[in-house]
């Protein structure tokens, strides 16, 4: 069945997304499968449902089990299952395999380690990073947004990296940690001045007022692993984070590599409930690497 494994540590926050995705307007009901008991939506509960998300604030070992989410459209009900396991905190430094997220590989040119699942949480920078339980110190390590960059990667940088951050829910803070292995590989490649594939410069996109729309900024930076390759959106020349409009959210950049070996990154700007004032903004797609910065501008117009 449509099922997803999720895990966490006791006394930490855990947020799980329903594996059955639907449109944002669809209702999502959550149940504890063993008892068929409905999960409450009131935020005063330690475990509560919030649309597509199931929140354990904080999690307890007894929360382990299978949770059912039913996504309801006007004519279809679709079911997903979240298999949740909450573990006791380890007394020593060792992080067991069952608490590890997917392994990532890096090279001298590309040493980004993303903090797993962080996009589900309401967190603020900076992240804390640990390698084999030791806090990372020194200028080689740069905590940037939701990832860690290591300068001049060497083979002994391989190991288990843990990110630690604070999730905030209605003024209360909860700790979250996530660990993944990092391996180092030797890779031949090259980097170029960024090439923006989309949008075209000075493009205009037609949108419906009141509807949702997505803008994709897609750029390529060369072949093979890239040391620095950033794709982001700006609004009227300002960072999205500085633009206090919760309807407009930028997704974490998704790495993409094509059959021709080009290393590209896509970053999506999601605009919910498009308003007239959004048509007045200038949307800049920025692609930056060590060679320089390229900018393409797109504007919105009413359909």
């Amino acid at each position: 069945k449509f099922s997803k494994q999720s895990w966490g540590l006791e006394n930490e926050a855990l947020i799980v997304r329903c594996p059955r995705q639907g449109k944002s307007s669809y209702i999502v009901d959550w149940y504890y499968s063993q008892t068929n008991k409905s999960i409450p939506t009131q935020e005063r509960n330690r475990v509560f449902a919030s649309g597509q998300l199931l929140k354990f604030l904080p999690a307890e070992v007894a929360d382990s089990g299978i949770y059912t989410c039913i996504v309801r459209s006007p004519t279809f009900n679709r079911t997903g299952y979240a298999n949740v396991t909450i573990y006791k905190k380890q007394p020593d430094c060792n992080v067991p395999d069952y608490l590890m997220y997917s392994t990532v590989s890096g090279s001298e040119k590309n040493s980004k380690i993303y903090c797993p699942t962080i996009d589900l949480y309401n967190w603020t920078a900076p992240l804390e990073w640990f390698k084999n339980c030791q806090a990372l110190q020194g200028s080689r390590y740069k905590a940037h947004k939701s990832f860690l960059v290591i300068d001049n990667v060497m083979t002994d940088d391989a190991g288990d990296y843990t990110c630690k951050f604070i999730h905030n829910e209605n003024g209360a803070n909860y700790s979250v940690t996530a660990t993944r292995s990092f391996t180092v590989k030797d890779e031949q490649g090259f980097s170029l001045f960024p090439v923006i594939r989309a949008p075209a410069h000075n493009e205009t996109k037609e949108v419906e007022i009141g509807e949702n729309t997505n803008l994709t900024c897609s750029a390529c930076f060369g072949k093979g692993a890239q040391f620095l390759a950033t794709v982001q959106w700006q609004l009227n020349g300002n960072k999205i984070t500085d633009f206090s409009e919760p309807r407009i959210q930028q997704e974490e950049g998704q790495n993409q590599s094509f059959s021709n070996g080009l290393a590209c990154v896509n970053t999506v700007l999601r605009i919910a409930d498009v308003k007239e004032e959004d048509l007045l903004l200038r949307y800049d797609c920025l692609a930056l690497n060590l060679h320089g910065l390229r900018r393409h501008t797109i504007r919105l117009s009413r359909k």
């Epitope: 069945k1 279809f76 997505n214």
Partner: antibody, heavy 123, light 106 residues
């Protein structure tokens, strides 16, 4: 009531072009992905092309890639299929159908279908 | 692409009998599988989605089961209007249809 009505089929010579239309009513057209499916005479169903609700995502079956173009005009509640470089094996009844769930770029079932329009490619 | 193989190609049964139709996928499609009914000169009609859920207005005699690569459509007691061609469709990776099973009157 949801209704889909295809038009634009007919007889065309190999190498020729045809544009199919599908007029939709009874639902918020821009909310849903739309799909073209075809059925050669006496044969099974073959998926042809997909377009997301806002028109930003399109997919094609390998058999039509580079020759067919799917598009939509949400202001007119109309779906299109531009068919170029037509071949004898494109002869089929072409159905437009609604994918009522699909988030942009994903697929689901087809809950409403048009009655189909026949395309015959022959010299 | 994911290939769906339906069996048997033809099923000859009498009204009131139980019909069991099979659909096998070349790789796992989780439960992203649907069943359709098509009568001559008509467009297909959705019966089952997500392998086992009946679409709105579909009689209870139609049921679906399976997950992964092996799926079954069961018609518990055939009515005269059930004699038609049945197609399975996967939507896990793009869309593909099976080649169809014809249920005909014996």
């Amino acid at each position: 009531e949801v209704q889909l009505l295809e038009s634009g089929g007919g007889l065309v010579q190999p190498g020729g072009s045809l544009r199919l239309s599908c007029a939709a009513s009874g639902f918020t057209f821009s909310d849903d992905a739309m799909i073209w499916v075809r059925q050669a005479p006496g044969k099974g169903l073959e998926w042809v092309s997909y377009i997301g609700g806002n028109g930003g995502t399109t997919y094609y079956a390998d058999s039509v890639k580079g020759r067919f173009t799917i598009s939509r005009d949400n202001s007119k509640n109309t779906l299109y299929l531009q068919m170029n470089s037509l071949r004898a094996e494109d002869t089929a009844v072409y159905y437009c159908a609604r994918d009522p769930w699909s988030t942009e770029g994903s697929f689901f079932v087809l809950d409403y279908w048009g009655q189909g329009t026949l395309v015959t490619v022959s010299s | 692409e994911i290939v769906l193989t339906q069996s048997p190609a033809t099923l000859s049964l009498s009204p009131g009998e139980r019909a069991t139709l099979s659909c096998r996928a070349s790789q796992s499609v989780d439960d992203d599988l649907a069943w359709y009914q098509q009568k001559p000169g008509q467009a297909p009609r959705l019966l089952i989605y997500d392998a086992s859920n009946r679409a709105t207005g579909i009689p209870a005699r139609f049921s679906g089961s399976g997950s992964g690569t092996d799926f079954t459509l069961t018609i518990s007691s055939l009515e005269p209007e059930d004699f038609a061609v049945y197609y399975c469709q996967q939507y896990n990776d793009a869309i593909t249809f099976g080649q169809g099973t014809k249920v005909e009157i014996k």
